[in-house]
């Protein structure tokens, strides 16, 4: 089930998925002056079997001005360039996402892609938050959000993160580690089924994350 909304916005913070659950879609968007090739894919889709997941379809952009020039690139994961991903840039892979069953790693860039990616997340997806450069984090709980299905509707849990404007030499002085709870806030709706998956594996992964995995340069 696709999540009906985007993850919550936290002032002066950005979010990133460390791995994308099967069923996640990424729109093939091109930057200004470029368009998808004729009859080109509308999106990439994270799909596969129990042993391996990968992105199906390929995004390709071509100049709006020319008819026949097709611009595309499919670099290897280790050759990935920096670019904006949803709201956060991803200069490197923090964990071996290929080892996460049922998940895809960050899709490699395609030439002339738009500066902001439009992802369609699925239930059970977790995203992680980090304060932007110049702001420090005050944690009251996990700096993460999970898309959950509750009473037949999807919603994102609220990340327990406040970013304050105090300049610090180190980005996260005295930062406590994210707690292993996938739930950002206490729930009042305890009487109904909550459909979520792989919290444990993702929170274990979150616990091993270093703060340095997030770039602090933004467009």
């Amino acid at each position: 089930e696709l999540c009906d909304d985007d993850p919550p916005e936290i002032p002066h913070a950005t979010f990133k998925a460390m791995a994308y659950k099967e069923g996640t879609m990424l729109n093939c968007e091109c930057k200004r002056g470029f368009r998808r090739i004729k009859s080109g894919s509308l999106y990439m889709l994270c799909t596969g079997n129990s042993s391996h997941s990968s992105w199906d379809n390929q995004c390709q952009c071509t100049s709006s001005a020319t008819r026949n020039t097709t611009k595309q690139v499919t670099p290897q994961p280790e050759e990935q360039k920096e670019r904006k991903t949803t709201e956060m840039q991803s200069p490197m892979q923090p964990v071996d996402q290929a080892s996460l069953p049922g998940h895809c790693r960050e899709p490699p860039p395609w030439e002339n892609e738009a500066t902001e990616r439009i992802y369609h997340f699925v239930v059970g997806q977790m995203v992680y938050y980090q304060c932007v450069q110049g702001y420090r984090a005050l944690h009251r709980g996990p700096a993460e959000s999970v898309c959950k299905m509750t009473h037949g509707k999807t919603r994102w849990t609220q990340p327990q993160l406040i970013c304050t404007g105090e300049m610090e030499t180190s980005q996260f002085p005295g930062e406590e580690k994210p707690q292993a709870s996938p739930e950002g806030r206490p729930e009042s709706e305890t009487s109904c089924l909550v459909t979520t998956t792989d919290f444990q594996i993702q929170t274990e992964m979150a616990a091993t994350m270093e703060t340095s995995i997030f770039t602090t340069e933004y467009q």
Epitope: L2, D4, G23, E29, L45, T47, H120
Partner: antibody, heavy 117, light 103 residues
């Protein structure tokens, strides 16, 4: 539950235009691609184009480009497909369909368009 | 990109095993199949080549890779009489359809 309800049958003269609507309910309209597929009598399904209502991004089949326009009214959760310069070969059942990623998971009931002089 | 199905029409008896093939003009990673009955909208049937959509009976299966794909019905039932279309997600092209008739 998800529903796609299309407008009623149309009879048009050659050279005219037709605009078919598809009213979506039961899901977040702006977050799914909506496609238009047609089926002439006794023939295969034929993809015409799609729209992403979240930003009005569209994609058209080369066969119909220039003749088809797909739009969406997010306030009414309705997608539209307009086909111009109609000819007899455009007589078909026109379907709207929601793209779930893996497949088109929900389809409208179909709108019969007859082009006849 | 074109998808060619065979056969166009197949008359079969209940409990028979049925195989429908779809050949794509270019190699693609996955194939989808839709079922359509007369005067009805198509229904998603098989996706990602071999995964059954919810509600699809277990007698249906899909397989294939590259350019050649197959939809198999292990033991045909009367309710399976329909037209089956293969579909390439990346190019949105449909095969011409295979109509299954019950003898």
């Amino acid at each position: 539950q998800v529903q796609l309800v299309q407008s009623g049958a149309e009879v048009k003269k050659p050279g005219a235009s037709v605009k078919v609507s598809c009213k979506a309910s039961g899901y977040s309209f702006t977050r799914y691609w909506m496609h238009w597929v047609r089926q002439p009598p006794g023939q295969r399904l034929e993809w015409m184009g799609a729209i992403y209502p979240g930003n009005s991004d569209t994609s058209y089949s080369q066969k119909f480009e220039g003749r088809v326009t797909i739009t969406a009214d997010t306030s009414a959760s309705t997608a539209y497909m307009e086909l111009s310069s109609l000819r007899s070969e455009d007589t078909a059942v026109y379907y709207c369909s929601r793209d779930y990623g893996y497949y088109f998971d929900f389809w409208g009931q179909g709108t019969t368009v007859t082009v006849s002089s | 990109i074109v998808s060619t199905q065979s056969p166009d029409t197949q008359s079969v008896t209940p409990k028979e095993k049925v195989t429908i093939t779809c050949r794509a003009s270019s190699s693609r990673s996955y194939m989808q199949w839709y079922q359509q009955k007369p005067d009805q909208s198509p229904k998603r049937w098989i996706y990602d080549t071999s995964k059954s959509a919810s509600g699809v009976p277990s007698r249906f299966s899909g397989s294939g890779s590259g350019t050649d794909y197959t939809l198999t019905i292990n033991s045909l039932e009367a309710e399976d009489a329909a037209t089956y279309y293969c579909h390439q997600r990346s190019s949105y092209t449909f095969g011409q359809g295979t109509k299954l008739e019950i003898k």
